[in-house]
Interface confidence: medium
């Protein structure tokens, strides 16, 4: 694992994987299908979705002082999105195209989250609702929204790892 004893991650490895995640998230987004907006949703940002915010220690100074706060936040987000991508939202009808990058995206989220998980240490992960089979139009709308949100999340994570690789690597 990349965080032996919970010290610092393999920044370069994390940077490479996070950049791959960015590419996959952008390539997956247009492929989730046409959205049938038969029912409007709430358009506010929900508190249940992990965001990387100012107080999370992901700024250059925060990463220098103690990168664990930021890495824990990123880890929570990766697990959150990994669960969503593995849920009925993406596995149910309408089926994704056989060559869809969503499968790769799911695997890469899991891979990066494992790189960040310290040996023998388990960060608390956010509970997400039990994602019971939703109607096809709901799945399409959710796929669109989840991937859009994931793009923003991995873009910030990639910047964090790029900074770490450039300035914090041993």
């Amino acid at each position: 694992r990349a965080v032996p004893g919970g010290s610092s991650p393999a920044w370069t490895q994390c940077q490479q994987l996070s950049q791959k995640l960015c590419t996959l998230a952008w390539s997956a987004h247009p492929l989730v299908g046409h959205m049938d907006l038969r029912e409007e949703g709430d358009e506010e940002t929900t508190n249940d979705v992990p965001h990387i915010q100012c107080g999370d220690g992901c700024d250059p100074q925060g990463l220098r002082d103690n990168s664990q706060f930021c890495l824990q936040r990123i880890h929570q987000g990766l697990i959150f999105y990994e669960k969503l991508l593995g849920s009925d939202i993406f596995t149910g009808e309408p089926s994704l195209l056989p060559d869809s990058p969503v499968g790769q995206l799911h695997a890469s989220l899991l891979g990066l989250s494992q790189l960040l998980q310290p040996e023998g240490h388990h960060w608390e992960t956010q509970q997400i609702p039990s994602l019971s089979p939703s109607q096809p139009w709901q799945r399409l709308l959710l796929r669109f929204k989840i991937l859009r949100s994931l793009q923003a999340f991995v873009a910030v994570a990639a910047r964090v790892f790029a900074h770490g690789a450039a300035t914090l690597s041993p």
């Epitope: 409007e40 019971s132 709901q138 959710l142």
Partner: antibody, heavy 127, light 108 residues
Framework: EVQLLESGGGLVQPGGSLRLSCAAS????????MQWVRQAPGKGLEWVSR????????RYADSVKGRFTISRDNSKNTLYLQMNSLRAEDTAVYYC????????????????????WGQGTTVTVSS | DIQMTQSPSSLSASVGDRVTITCRAS??????LNWYQQKPGKAPKLLIY???SLQSGVPSRFSGSGSGTDFTLTISSLQPEDFATYYC??????????FGQGTKLEIK
Amino acid sequence: EVQLLESGGGLVQPGGSLRLSCAASGFTFSKYTMQWVRQAPGKGLEWVSRISSSGGATRYADSVKGRFTISRDNSKNTLYLQMNSLRAEDTAVYYCARDLGQTIFGVVIGFGGMDVWGQGTTVTVSS
Amino acid sequence: DIQMTQSPSSLSASVGDRVTITCRASQSISSYLNWYQQKPGKAPKLLIYAASSLQSGVPSRFSGSGSGTDFTLTISSLQPEDFATYYCQQSYSTPPYTFGQGTKLEIK
């Protein structure tokens, strides 16, 4: 204890208005989609309206559309049903109920079962 | 709107009997089917959601099955407290969430 308590029912003349309230306790009200369901005397259950967790998405039965307005105040843990232009056929016991569905990314998902109900409040529309 | 038809509309049975109530949707509703029990003067109580999932706290003698258009609520061994009216409800197509007309279960 998870509880819903309706109030505001009563006798009203045709064409009149009433506002029903439903006070929630024992759970995080702001996370749940909520419903109103009614039952006319001696009749079955009729779904009336639904509101998403933040109040941003509402739905109505055709029979009340344009006359009833569902709303919520999450800071007060309270659900409302404003009923205008009341008709004799609106006479019923009105129940508020919590929806099993969850809102994620602004979309209500889940099965729409109602797992917690209030005791009901009676609305009588008569001249 | 999707119509829900329950049968029978009333039913007489004895304590210990196995009872089956059926619900048919006018079009496929996948597994979006819930069952409620209501006693006179009381609010409905959720028994089964998602066609076959037993709601927490509901006795295991209640079970649900079906998918698509045809659904069944079964009470394996009727108890005195089970005499009530039962409603099915679809939540596939909203609005509206439509209920069946109810099945009144009475003591024989």
